[in-house]
């Protein structure tokens, strides 16, 4: 049974083209070609990583039942955000001995392409989602989740890894983006801002949400993440925006109530298993999808991003707990742990529902209606 949570009608964004090759060759007229906020050093989008071939051939999973109403991201007001002041701070990094992957931080040295060359790739994440430019793709069917309602035992490991809070998931959480596109969930983590400063990674029409959840999945065509990195569809991330609502979200409280125990970087605790699907919006049929990358080093491309149109509501107190409890290395708070939005570079974001309109709110700009390449074909 699902835990109750509040959700409201405000547009969310994020999506992926489900195809192996991003759609389009050139930037579309009104898509951003530079990040909304100043890129932290090392996050510039430069020519880079090639996509490697990959295959997925997996069993079907059962659809999740539909319940509550949904929030519509495409109904959010258009926000002109030529310069988003929320620049990530230089406070979220891991300061352990490690290879390049463990020596990185938000908004400072070393430059991410030095940590991992893929971070300079052309098809990076996150991106700004413009619903009016999304290609409606009827082939994008409701997501199917199976086994996400975990029993209390075995307990799950909740860890402050210095750049996020992460919940490691057991085997058996199956997710299907469509027939033959099957995945298993590996972990979930959050991105957030600071007091009065939103911290989602994806944006919608330049609007940044308070926070964002990512559930990272590995294609069942691959045994390990390392083998899937850079392969089209090798990894898939479900993303949802977190917004402020009037009530406490009981699902999230099961995690947020434990953050004090892992305030220190590198610390971890165990939490009872919970309904992971209750951390996501209830409407699995309305989402944006595009092909991008991991948003932290190694920044590998070929990642299928699915961003729910519906948001998840947390209370103001819960959002404050999220952004004001954890510490990164040294004496710095773990806050503003989001990457700058990256250029689409010709990619077309697909929508599983008609998110766009016939005319763009920007009258001065030409409107380009994008077509869908059926992701399931």
């Amino acid at each position: 049974q699902r835990l109750p949570r509040m959700q409201e009608d405000s547009p969310l964004g994020g999506g992926s083209s489900g195809e192996d090759d991003p759609l389009g060759e050139e930037d579309l007229p009104s898509e951003e070609d530079s990040p909304r906020e100043e890129d932290p050093p090392g996050e510039e989008d430069l020519p880079g990583e090639e996509d490697l071939p990959g295959e997925e051939d997996l069993p079907e999973v059962k659809p999740k039942s539909e319940e509550e109403g949904s929030l519509k991201l495409e109904d959010l007001p258009t926000v002109e955000a030529p310069g988003d002041p929320q620049e990530p701070q230089n406070n979220a990094h891991r300061d352990k001995e490690g290879d390049d992957q463990s020596h990185w931080r938000y908004g400072g040295d070393p430059p991410w392409p030095r940590v991992s060359p893929a971070c300079a790739g052309r098809f990076q994440s996150p991106v700004d989602i413009r619903p009016q430019l999304a290609a409606f793709c009827p082939a994008l069917r409701p997501l199917e989740l199976l086994g996400f309602q975990l029993p209390p035992l075995p307990e799950l490991r909740l860890r402050n890894n210095g750049h996020s809070v992460q919940l490691t998931l057991p085997p058996g959480l199956e997710m299907a983006l469509g027939p033959g596109r099957e995945y298993r969930a590996l972990q979930l983590h959050l991105h957030w801002g600071a007091a009065g400063r939103p911290g989602s990674e994806h944006t919608v029409e330049g609007h940044r949400f308070p926070a964002e959840i990512h559930v990272v999945h590995l294609s069942t065509a691959f045994a390990r993440v390392d083998e899937a990195l850079g392969r089209p569809g090798g990894l898939a991330v479900l993303a949802a925006f977190l917004e402020e609502g009037p009530e406490e979200n009981s699902a999230y409280e099961q995690l947020l109530s434990r953050l004090e125990e892992i305030a220190e970087e590198g610390s971890e605790t165990q939490v009872p298993g919970l309904d992971i699907s209750a951390l996501l919006p209830s409407d699995f049929s309305r989402y944006f999808q595009y092909e991008g990358s991991l948003t932290t080093p190694p920044c590998a491309q070929g990642v299928i991003w699915t961003v729910f149109n519906q948001t998840v509501m947390l209370s103001a107190k819960q959002l404050h707990t999220l952004s004001d409890t954890l510490w990164g290395p040294g004496d710095s708070r773990l806050q503003l742990n989001f990457r700058a939005t990256q250029p689409l570079n010709g990619r077309v974001i697909e929508a599983s529902f008609p998110a766009g309109v016939d005319s763009s709110p920007r009258a001065a700009e030409p409107v380009q209606l994008n077509s869908c390449l059926a992701a399931g074909d």
Epitope: K96, P154, A223, R224
Partner: antibody, heavy 122, light 111 residues
Framework: QSVKESGGRLVTPGTPLTLTCTVS????????MIWVRQAPGEGLEYIGF?????TTYYASWAKGRFTISRTSTTVDLKLTRPTTEDTATYFC???????????????????WGPGTLVTISS | ELVMTQTPSSVSAAVGGTVTINCQAS??????LAWYQQKPGQPPKLLIY???TLASGVPSRFKGSGSGTEFTLTITGVQCDDAATYYC?????????????FGGGTELEIK
């Protein structure tokens, strides 16, 4: 790419002993490592694991009895207060592929070292 | 706690015959099961990973199958060199208490 254990010897019960796994041809910052033991004539027994970021995990029976640590090229296994039941050949092995702490995936180990024999006897 | 139950504990086969070894996980581990071969005085050698993927250099007469909780190692056309003890390794997850476990082993004798 290889791993090799050393440090195994005869010690009396209660005497701490540290085994060392020396690796070559790969970086411990890219590969997780596991320690396994095998008592004479018995099967393989998982002891513990160290991630690329240096985080350690142990089998529940091994907590408090063993400590895993590492340097840039070695992974140590300390037997804190060994008993006669800890007499065994101790193996270290490398994760099959590169691993990333943030994803927590694991499936198999290869290569393995030849093992080092620890005898606990009074 | 993940427990791997391996059967049989010993098996005998003639050269050219077929051997089947089973491994049962106490909870679902998806396809995260490996098979190892160990000969006396040697470390384990990886044969199969991800339940059914043959490790590099391993003869095709070794075949792994199964998922969830039931797994099988099949050796067809058994050869003298296959005399060894075989172990399954199940992985629920290293960050879970007792999330890594070996089966008890199966000793293969060649008649």
């Amino acid at each position: 790419q290889s791993v090799k254990e050393s440090g195994g010897r005869l010690v009396t019960p209660g005497t701490p002993l540290t085994l060392t796994c020396t690796v070559s041809g790969f970086s411990l910052n890219s590969y997780a490592m596991i320690w396994v033991r095998q008592a004479p004539g018995e099967g393989l027994e998982y002891i513990g694991f160290i991630t690329t970021g240096g985080t350690t995990y142990y089998a529940s029976w091994a907590k408090g009895r063993f400590t895993i640590s590492r340097t840039s090229t070695t992974v140590d296994l300390k037997l804190t207060r060994p008993t006669t039941e800890d007499t065994a050949t101790y193996f270290c092995a490398r994760d099959r592929v590169k691993s990333y702490d943030d994803y927590g995936d694991l499936d198999a180990f290869e290569p393995w070292g030849p093992g080092t024999l620890v005898t606990i006897s009074s | 706690e993940l427990v791997m139950t391996q059967t049989p504990s010993s098996v005998s086969a003639a050269v050219g015959g077929t051997v089947t070894i089973n491994c049962q996980a106490s909870q679902s581990i998806s396809s995260y099961l490996a098979w190892y071969q160990q000969k006396p005085g040697q470390p384990p050698k990886l044969l199969i990973y991800y339940a059914s993927t043959l490790a590099s250099g391993v003869p095709s007469r070794f075949k792994g199958s199964g998922s969830g909780t039931e797994f099988t190692l099949t050796i067809t056309g058994v050869q003298c060199d296959d005399a060894a003890t075989y172990y399954c390794l199940g992985v629920y997850g290293y960050s879970f208490d007792d999330g890594i476990a070996f089966g008890g082993g199966t000793e293969l004798e060649i008649k």
